[in-house]
């Protein structure tokens, strides 16, 4: 049993079931790729499931003497036979069972050769391979500025491979990117929110373990909204909690081709209402400024009191239009502050 594989899987050798002609039971993890070959020759061998010959195409297929299951599902459990064409001799008699508690090769399994544990789980060593190549078909991503972009390279292998990302051939960690990046190693994904023209380029995932490496490249083109209203960095300003008497900084980062004008607003209540007859919120203008593109605008609140608690809005405008994002300031009595504020994360709100 082998865990499958690269885009050129037909060029790779496959592994035969351990026992020939005897019945064998293998337990397979849900979602695990399966790849079995029938004997030493690819010719004249056909796989059958529950008496029906497997087609040569599809998610579960019998192909060139191989049994291939792209991603094991509950309905794939059952009895599989490999028969020699002509004589119809049973070459392999195999029952596949699903173990829902297994989802992939465990990281601590690192056998040197094909091996079968007492429970029937088979953990061969395997170079990295793409598990969901259909999710990688869109190579060119052309997206409007301000959108979120997600690149994926879902992979597996044994030992479990690591993933690294490159931008234009250089290691990419997003330190210099407004808003940073989000990496989810379990989902093999890179996410960039609120993309801007400087994000354009070639993004390459490099997946490797001790047995080999694979890579795949995506092209990102950011379509400028020409002209467009200001773009505000995701997650700024951030919700903040402070203790009475402390100082607070609210940050707003603006991207704008045209000269942006920034206002900091505090939402207020007038006659018991937060909104006027026109439907707009009542606000107090705290600060107005013009900044250069991509600079950080900061609202400083010194020696905060309970009256400073509430909703604050960063309003950015240019000749095209307005953008705004809001955050809440919570002010606690000193004795109530029993925790520390986490570093805010980048998010984008239109």
């Amino acid at each position: 049993l082998s865990l499958e594989a690269s885009e050129e899987m037909e060029q790779e050798p496959c592994l035969a079931p351990i026992l020939e002609q005897q019945e064998q039971v293998l337990t397979v993890a849900l979602g695990q790729p399966v790849r079995l070959c029938c004997g030493r020759t690819e010719r004249g061998r056909h796989w059958y499931k529950e008496g029906s010959r497997l087609a040569s195409a599809g998610r579960v297929r019998g192909w060139r003497g191989r049994l291939e299951i792209a991603s094991f599902l509950p309905e794939d459990a059952g009895r599989y036979l490999c028969l020699a064409r002509g004589s119809m001799t049973v070459v392999h008699n195999l029952t596949l069972l699903m173990d829902d508690s297994l989802t992939s090769i465990s990281n601590d399994e690192d056998p040197k050769t094909l091996s079968s544990s007492s429970s029937g789980h088979v953990y061969p060593q395997q170079a990295p391979y793409w598990t969901h190549p259909q999710r990688m078909e869109k190579k060119l991503h052309a997206v409007p500025a301000g959108n979120t972009v997600k690149f994926r390279c879902p992979a597996a292998g044994n030992p479990m491979p690591t993933i690294h990302w490159l931008k234009d051939g250089q290691a990419f960690h997003g330190e210099n990117r407004i808003g940073g990046i989000r990496l989810r190693h379990q989902h093999w994904s890179l996410v960039m929110e609120s993309v801007v023209p400087s994000d354009r380029g070639t993004y390459t995932c490099l997946v490797e373990n001790s047995l080999g490496s694979i890579r795949y490249s995506y092209l990102l083109d950011v379509l400028e909204r020409s002209p467009h209203r200001p773009i505000l960095q995701a997650g700024l300003p951030a919700n903040t909690t402070a203790v009475v008497g402390s100082d607070v900084e609210l940050l707003c980062k603006v991207y704008s081709d045209a000269q942006p004008h920034i206002q900091w607003l505090k939402h207020v209540v007038i006659n018991g209402s937060s909104f006027g007859a026109d439907g707009f919120p009542y606000v107090q203008v705290l600060k107005t400024t013009d900044i250069n593109s991509s600079e950080v605008e900061v609202l400083y609140l010194r020696n905060v009191s309970a009256e400073d608690a509430g909703e604050y809005t960063c309003l950015a405008g240019n000749s095209i239009g307005l953008s705004y994002q809001s955050a809440w300031l919570t002010v606690l009595p000193e004795e109530d502050l029993t925790w520390t504020t986490a570093t805010p994360e980048a998010r984008y709100t239109d």
Partner: antibody, heavy 119, light 107 residues
Framework: QVQLLESGGGLVQPGGSLRLSCAAS????????MSWVRQAPGKGLEWVSV????????HYADSVKGRFTISRDNSKNTLYLQMNSLRAEDTAVYYC????????????WGQGTLVTVSS | DIQMTQSPSSLSASVGDRVTITCRAS??????LNWYQQKPGKAPKLLIY???NLQSGVPSRFSGSGSGTDFTLTISSLQPEDFAVYYC?????????FGQGTKVEIK
């Protein structure tokens, strides 16, 4: 079989704190990302936070960022949500949910625990 | 944030009807969309993941389609146990926003 059991909900005053727990069984806990999703009375579902299987990645909804902290103890097969500076709008049933491998679909959910924020 | 808009917000149908619920994203989300069913007092249940994949154990009368910004959940022949609220959820961006829900009621 996979089971998720939330606990720790209850009545708390505005500005107060609560810690929710989610005990998991029936699967290899550390292999899965976990999320918290909440539902205010009579309202729709709102995703709250996610944490990767090894705890290396977390993310929060804007509405709770800076106030809530997600964490996990893989040795105890338990997921946590520390909720501080609670507001009336945080009143909801809180569900923990398991993410499918290679996806962010929640294939198993707990039964939920009710958090009521009121003075 | 990526906004998810479901339509209709509610619908009335009879057993045996073909029911279609749509979900629209505010930007391209590829196929990163899931569908859930929720009955009163119960936790949601995953029906469809990644736009079109039927979750194990879910009846085949449920199907999903779409990619990019427009998605559809179809119930080919409504059964009594299908009367519930249905939610879409995107997982393209780090914040996995849900649609506002569609209530399927008995006509």
């Amino acid at each position: 079989q996979v089971q998720l059991l939330e606990s720790g909900g209850g009545l708390v005053q505005p500005g107060g704190s609560l810690r929710l727990s989610c005990a998991a069984s029936g699967f290899t806990f550390s292999d899965y990302a976990m999320s918290w999703v909440r539902q205010a009375p009579g309202k729709g579902l709102e995703w709250v936070s996610v944490i990767e299987g090894d705890g290396s990645y977390t993310h929060y909804a804007d509405s709770v960022k800076g106030r809530f902290t997600i964490s996990r103890d893989n040795s105890k097969n338990t997921l946590y949500l520390q909720m501080n500076s609670l507001r009336a709008e945080d009143t909801a049933v809180y569900y923990c949910a398991r993410e499918k491998t290679y996806s962010s679909a929640f294939d198993y959910w707990g039964q939920g625990t009710l958090v009521t924020v009121s003075s | 944030d990526i906004q998810m808009t479901q339509s209709p917000s509610s619908l009335s149908a009879s057993v045996g009807d073909r029911v279609t619920i749509t979900c629209r994203a505010s930007q391209d989300i590829s196929s990163d969309l899931n569908w859930y069913q929720q009955k009163p007092g119960k936790a949601p249940k995953l029906l469809i993941y990644d736009a079109s994949n039927l979750q194990s154990g879910v009846p085949s009368r449920f199907s999903g389609s779409g990619s990019g910004t427009d998605f559809t959940l179809t119930i080919s022949s409504l059964q009594p146990e299908d009367f519930a609220v249905y939610y879409c959820q995107q997982h393209y961006s780090p914040s996995h926003t849900f649609g506002q829900g569609t209530k399927v009621e008995i006509k």
